[in-house]
């Protein structure tokens, strides 16, 4: 069984999710990479991807998502700016490696976006939100559509674990043979 871990981010509308996905430098530097959302019972959906081959430090922006692949660092940086409540969900980075199936990079991101400012006593969400106007789209990359001969298993269930600290992880065990197939709307 594969042990899948998540990191949970709780942010306000208007804020930015800024995360990294590490990869093996020698193996995947120029491979095309993608950012996907995983909805319960559905195949992962690709929201944005780098160019093919992936260019070093070249930002690719699709709507409010900005991808930057730092070859020399062995990491894909993903930013989702001006977050909306509807952006809440489970996300992952994958590396395309046709004809093989996409390779998932750990860890997954559980994003929870809430409205406005929390004024509850003791809350650490102690500030008004920032609404940042993003510049027009720069580069768009076409993401390939891959199909798999094998059945796509259901995405892992939404965790009910209480994740209260940044270091907390949700450990999903007994999740076997998850096929990651990026799809379009």
């Amino acid at each position: 069984a594969t042990k899948l871990t998540e990191e949970k981010y709780e942010l306000k509308e208007g804020q930015t999710l800024d995360v990294k996905c590490d990869y093996t430098l020698e193996k995947f530097a120029s491979s095309q990479k993608a950012w996907q959302i995983i909805r319960d019972g559905e195949m992962p959906k690709t929201l944005a991807c780098t160019e093919r081959p992936s260019k070093n430090s070249h930002p690719v922006q699709v709507g409010r998502i900005i991808l930057e692949d730092y070859h020399d660092h062995g990491l894909l940086r993903v930013r989702m700016v001006n977050l909306q409540v509807e952006d809440s969900g489970l996300y992952q980075c994958v590396i395309y490696q046709p004809p093989k199936e996409p390779h998932m990079l750990f860890d997954r991101i559980r994003l929870v976006v809430t409205k406005g400012f929390s004024g509850t006593p003791g809350s650490n969400e102690n500030s008004t939100q920032n609404v940042y106007k993003i510049p027009p789209t720069t580069t768009k990359a076409l993401c390939p559509l891959y199909t798999s001969p094998r059945t796509v298993t259901q995405a892992p269930p939404k965790s009910t674990a209480d994740v209260s600290t940044p270091d907390s992880e949700i450990n999903l065990t007994n999740v076997t043979d998850i096929i990651r197939v990026p799809v379009f709307n």
Epitope: D18, K20, Y132, P166
Partner: antibody, heavy 121, light 105 residues
């Protein structure tokens, strides 16, 4: 609990090298980047670079490229920062720091106690 | 190279509110962290992700952001808050602001 314990103070001559260690405990060493930050007397915090303990790969601030080397020994959960060709300008307190999460580069939630490196002839 | 700009110094009377700014290009789409540094001590993270407080940091510390400017606010400033404060963001590399010396008069 997470702890970063650095090696002791060093006095070096100009032109020499110094190697500072940072021993991590209380967490999985491979999972989080280790950063090195310095503060020279009367100056601000200066980020020097990060080390990915999992791969051993490092990313250095442009200013330090070519004369800083960051390495690790995973068997003893220790990161190292070596600075060569020292000058008096390198007299500073050197800190190691750990990322808050596996999936971010900032912020630095955990810090070592600092190592004073004095460069003097 | 990317730069974050802070005022060199800010003065405040005890019990009053201190505000320290940090500005930088496209800071609006970057997460800002704030650190407190006292002489002879290691830096302490006081704010991350623009406005979150780590556990153990007093509620009087808060963060906000407006456009490309981040603001660290200390309400009801106490003598123990006298320190240097640094903002931080991740551009292609990690960057610290020049630091602001907070003096509690």
């Amino acid at each position: 609990q997470v702890q970063l314990v650095q090696s002791g103070a060093e006095v070096k001559k100009p032109g020499a090298s110094v190697k500072v260690s940072c021993k991590a405990s209380g967490y999985t060493f491979n999972g989080y980047y280790i950063h090195w930050v310095r503060q020279a007397p009367g100056q601000g915090l200066e980020w020097m670079g990060w080390l990915n303990p999992n791969s051993g790969g490092a990313n250095y601030a442009q200013k330090f490229q070519g004369w800083v080397t960051m390495t690790r020994d995973t068997s003893i959960s220790t990161a190292y920062m070596e600075l060569s060709r020292l000058t008096s300008d390198d007299t500073a307190v050197y800190y190691c720091a750990r990322d808050q999460r596996k999936t971010t580069v900032t912020p630095f939630e955990y810090w070592g106690q600092g190592t004073l490196v004095t460069v003097s002839s | 190279s990317y730069e974050l700009t802070q005022p060199p110094s800010v003065s405040v009377s005890p019990g009053q509110t201190a505000s320290i700014t940090c500005s930088g290009d496209k800071l609006g789409e970057r997460n800002v962290s704030w650190y407190q540094l006292k002489p002879g001590q290691s830096p302490i993270l006081v704010i991350y992700q623009d406005n979150k407080r780590p556990s153990g940091i007093p509620e009087r510390f808060s963060g906000s952001k407006s456009g490309n400017t981040a603001i660290l606010t200390i309400s009801g400033t106490q003598a123990m808050d006298e320190a240097d404060y640094y903002c931080q963001a991740w551009d292609r590399n990690v960057v610290f602001g020049g630091g602001t010396k907070l003096t509690v008069l």
